[in-house]
Interface confidence: low
Amino acid sequence: KIDACKRGDVTVKPSHVILLGSTVNITCSLKPRQGCFHYSRRNKLILYKFDRRINFHHGHSLNSQVTGLPLGTTLFVCKLACINSDEIQICGAEIFVGVAPEQPQNLSCIQKGEQGTVACTWERGRDTHLYTEYTLQLSGPKNLTWQKQCKDIYCDYLDFGINLTPESPESNFTAKVTAVNSLGSSSSLPSTFTFLDIVRPLPPWDIRIKFQKASVSRCTLYWRDEGLVLLNRLRYRPSNSRLWNMVNVTKAKGRHDLLDLKPFTEYEFQISSKLHLYKGSWSDWSESLRAQTPEEEPTGMLDVWYMKRHIDYSRQQISLFWKNLSVSEARGKILHYQVTLQELTGGKAMTQNITGHTSWTTVIPRTGNWAVAVSAANSKGSSLPTRINIMNLCEAGLLAPRQVSANSEGMDNILVTWQPPRKDPSAVQEYVVEWRELHPGGDTQVPLNWLRSRPYNVSALISENIKSYICYEIRVYALSGDQGGCSSILGNSKHKAPLSGPHINAITEEKGSILISWNSIPVQEQMGCLLHYRIYWKERDSNSQPQLCEIPYRVSQNSHPINSLQPRVTYVLWMTALTAAGESSHGNEREFCLQGKAN
């Protein structure tokens, strides 16, 4: 009933709860003396479905047959309409449309852990749209039965609250779930199981790892399990990997030796448990243990390269460079690099530990035969030393690679190509391609990059530390025994016209000609490799085209003579620079008048 229904009643036949597709009869009737005042014949009863008028009738009662009601709840309200007054609500009723429960499917029961309680889940099937009660029944040996009811709207889980024990692990238990509502009932197929079938062990806990004698090769994983566990699965992976290594073990009794871990690597470990070889289910994975394996001494050898610079007649500067070992080669934190410099004939040697750098510079005599050895050390030991004889890398002209070229190859890559040296090409043991940012001052602090190439290769793609709009000095060395030859070229990965022209800083007169001196364009304004400078001049106040002189770019050059100026004529001079992409804007303008005699 919707309200007190003082004025009349609404009755529903056959029931307020009906099966989807059924017809229902709704009757609205007025109680005595509750019609329109003086005009009982004028009573107009109106039936509403929610807010929509579906039927009306003059008199004391109204009958309506309703079909096609949707699943769920529909509200019907009966109202009385009298002349010259608002409609008055008489009474109302809710009709519940639903279906009988379907047979519950896939009933499955589980007990989480040996001390847990039995809980079952099932699939309800389609929604009944009606209040439906589920009863779960469990029967066991010795006619024991347990029952639990569930009155939630969406009930598909029930916990019996009882604990199955392993005293008779092969004893059978049978579970069944029954769904009941006003329109019918249905029971699941029975599910029969034993203790071993349904007990799902708790995940292992208290996971620890021990490295005997701080060695990765003697590693044991420990954990704790419930008492009846027979099988374990272990999975582990480096923390930065997505792929797991899996191991199955039987009767592990809470420990397992791992033999294939990499040194100095953080691993994630998880373990799962099972009570029986083919019955029951695996536990959830344990919480992850993260642990870092100990260091081992480095493997591999450092890639070492060097540069020689003449200081004076008796001394030379040696700069050594080396690349970090890969993580898998370093096998730990590299604490220092050990550099040994030795004069081979006299046997003099000096050793130095370098920390925090991958380069070392020293000054040695120009005489004698010198060799270096470089190794990397972590807490467990050192890598095998890389030994290099210091030689004049460009001394053997016949070993110089020929036709060296450098071309842009996509973003921030340069393709270097060459032809083998004229001397027997089969004598070449390897090529080394070296590159560094071009600095006009020949700055030795500029980082050096290199890569090694096999003797049958005649090209190399350089991409490490290559920036756009920067010019690189590239050298290709051919190495053969204790000899080397080299060729060099300038190259860039991307270029555009320089942002500014050279700044003329002085013009001096020398025997009827002039010498122009300029400052180099700042590296960040060169926008690639410079090919030429141009010097422009024209008579002051003249509208004629300027004359120009084009000079090939050389790193060290910053002056040039011009001898075609007329004496006692004032000229305006300026300079530009060119890359392969075009010419810069003008540098500063300078005026000059040659004082020499006219011819």
Partner: nanobody, 125 residues
Amino acid sequence: EVQLVESGGGLVQPGGSLILSCAVSGFTSDYYVIAWFRQTPGHEREGVSSIRIGDGATYYADSVKGRFSISRDNAKNMVYLQMNSLKPEDTAVYTCAARYDTLLGGGRPREFPYWGQGTQVTVSS
């Protein structure tokens, strides 16, 4: 032989700070963990914070997160516990403990074979 010696305990007012030090000797590699535990009369030892010497990874119990900070000085073989915003309930004997291996986490006292003698910290107004 592994030895641990704590220092730095004392009386401090609520809201104050204190630094505990643990001098470590006798380990033959960096693969060990130093942990600080505390204990009040009638209660079990509680793991407060730990640090893995090899890489400096740290762990803190929920009760001290954001207030305590653990650090190491490998050159001096020292581990420090900086305790800020101290509360009366932080009053306890603080002891540093050590074990070989790289497992971090709170750990139970029985997992640590090496212990210092302890230092008293009292937080009171």
